[in-house]
Interface confidence: low
């Protein structure tokens, strides 16, 4: 399996990964919204998807990965696996992954998944904008 880098990737590599992730994320979110109409966003789920200690903000892969591993059995496994593969490339070796529990209640679970997908898409937009506004 892919070994996480021990150093920060160059911006050009990060940009390629973000470009790979954006359509995957958007497609997953749109498919889920079509399939699960009327499911509200959960205000108790917070994806800490950006690092607060770097400028421009960096995608916090170690914080995001556990959520996608958690929702993998409950969503489109093929797309989720592609997202995990890309996020793995961004993950630093020394960064621990936290454990994530999916709500047991079906409705809460759907709301949880929707929120993760929405927040992840928003994060990708934010990182992509900051990468494009910085030096190429």
């Amino acid at each position: 399996s892919h070994m996480a880098p021990t150093h920060q990737l160059p911006p050009s590599d990060v940009r390629k990964i973000i470009l790979e992730l954006q359509p995957l994320s958007r497609g997953l979110l749109e498919d889920y919204q079509k399939k699960e109409t009327g499911v509200p966003e959960s205000n108790r789920t917070l994806l800490l998807c950006l690092t607060s200690d770097s400028q421009p903000p960096r995608l916090n892969s170690s914080a995001i990965l556990p959520y996608f591993r958690a929702i993998r059995p409950l969503s489109d496994k093929n797309i989720i696996d592609k997202i995990i593969e890309q996020l793995d490339k961004l993950k630093f070796q020394h960064e621990p992954e936290t454990e994530i529990s999916v709500p047991a209640d079906t409705f809460e679970c759907k709301s949880f998944i929707l929120t993760i997908l929405q927040q992840f898409s928003a994060c990708l937009e934010s990182v992509f904008k900051s990468l494009n506004s910085g030096p190429q």
Partner: antibody, heavy 118, light 111 residues
Framework: EVQLVESGGDLVKPGGSLRLSCVAS????????MSWVRQAPGKGLQWVAT????????YYPDNIKGRFTISRDNAKNTLYLQMNSLRAEDTAMYYC???????????WGQGTLVTVSS | EIVMTQSPASLSLSQEEKVTITCKAS??????????MHWYQQKPGQAPKLLIY???NLEAGVPSRFSGSGSGTDFSFTISSLEPEDVAVYYC?????????FGQGTKLEIK
């Protein structure tokens, strides 16, 4: 109904040890992070320790790190706080608290009193 | 660590009056547009109870007269119309980063 019942509080001499327990019921214990928060007599609240739902991750403030250890036994629905090298300033009511999400403490037990005095 | 400065330390108001308590953090406690600030009520001889989580979300079962707002470093907690059962100490708490820290509390009394 969510219930958190603490026990193990006692009078102990400075330098002594104590183990607090918290038995949880009314929810799936293994799905939730848990914390200990304390309150010295007549004072405010102070966060003591947090443990992730599976027990892999633990967090402490600097003044407690190395002296206290938070742990859990999901099979027994029980949270623990092992307290070593106790000081007079550790005298407080210790509350067991359930976590929701990664950051919110939503249910509190009634507390167990720890008194450190010679 | 993030220091939480809560004010006022105590408050004595009449029934049905509006109550406002503020909490100022020494640095931003917001993340991705969400204020990681929570408010608790502690009645005499009881354990604290969560009222508001993540700045403005009302905890289930909590009366709608309680509300919260704010972002960044400045947050406020409001009781729209004070009731006798609201006599308690109120605490703010941040969970933006470890160590989690609380405000020193506001003691609320009825005149």
């Amino acid at each position: 109904e969510v219930q958190l019942v603490e026990s193990g509080g006692d009078l102990v001499k400075p330098g002594g040890s104590l183990r607090l327990s918290c038995v949880a019921s009314g929810f799936t214990f293994s799905n939730y992070g848990m914390s200990w928060v304390r309150q010295a007599p007549g004072k405010g609240l102070q966060w003591v320790a947090t443990i992730s739902y599976g027990g892999s991750y633990t967090y402490y403030p600097d003044n407690i790190k190395g002296r206290f250890t938070i742990s859990r036994d999901n099979a027994k629905n029980t949270l623990y706080l092992q307290m070593n090298s106790l000081r007079a300033e550790d005298t407080a009511m210790y509350y067991c608290v359930r976590g929701y999400g990664y950051d919110t403490m939503d249910y509190w037990g009634q507390g167990t009193l720890v008194t450190v005095s010679s | 660590e993030i220091v939480m400065t809560q004010s006022p330390a105590s408050l004595s108001l009449s029934q049905e009056e509006k109550v406002t308590i503020t909490c100022k953090a020494s640095q931003s406690v917001s993340f991705a547009g969400t204020g990681l600030m929570h408010w608790y009520q502690q009645k005499p001889g009881q354990a604290p109870k969560l009222l508001i989580y993540r700045a403005s979300n009302l905890e289930a079962g909590v009366p709608s007269r309680f509300s919260g707002s704010g972002s960044g470093t400045d947050f406020s907690f409001t009781i729209s119309s004070l009731e006798p059962e609201d006599v308690a100490v109120y605490y703010c708490q941040q969970s933006r980063e470890y160590p989690w820290t609380f405000g020193q509390g506001t003691k609320l009394e009825i005149k």
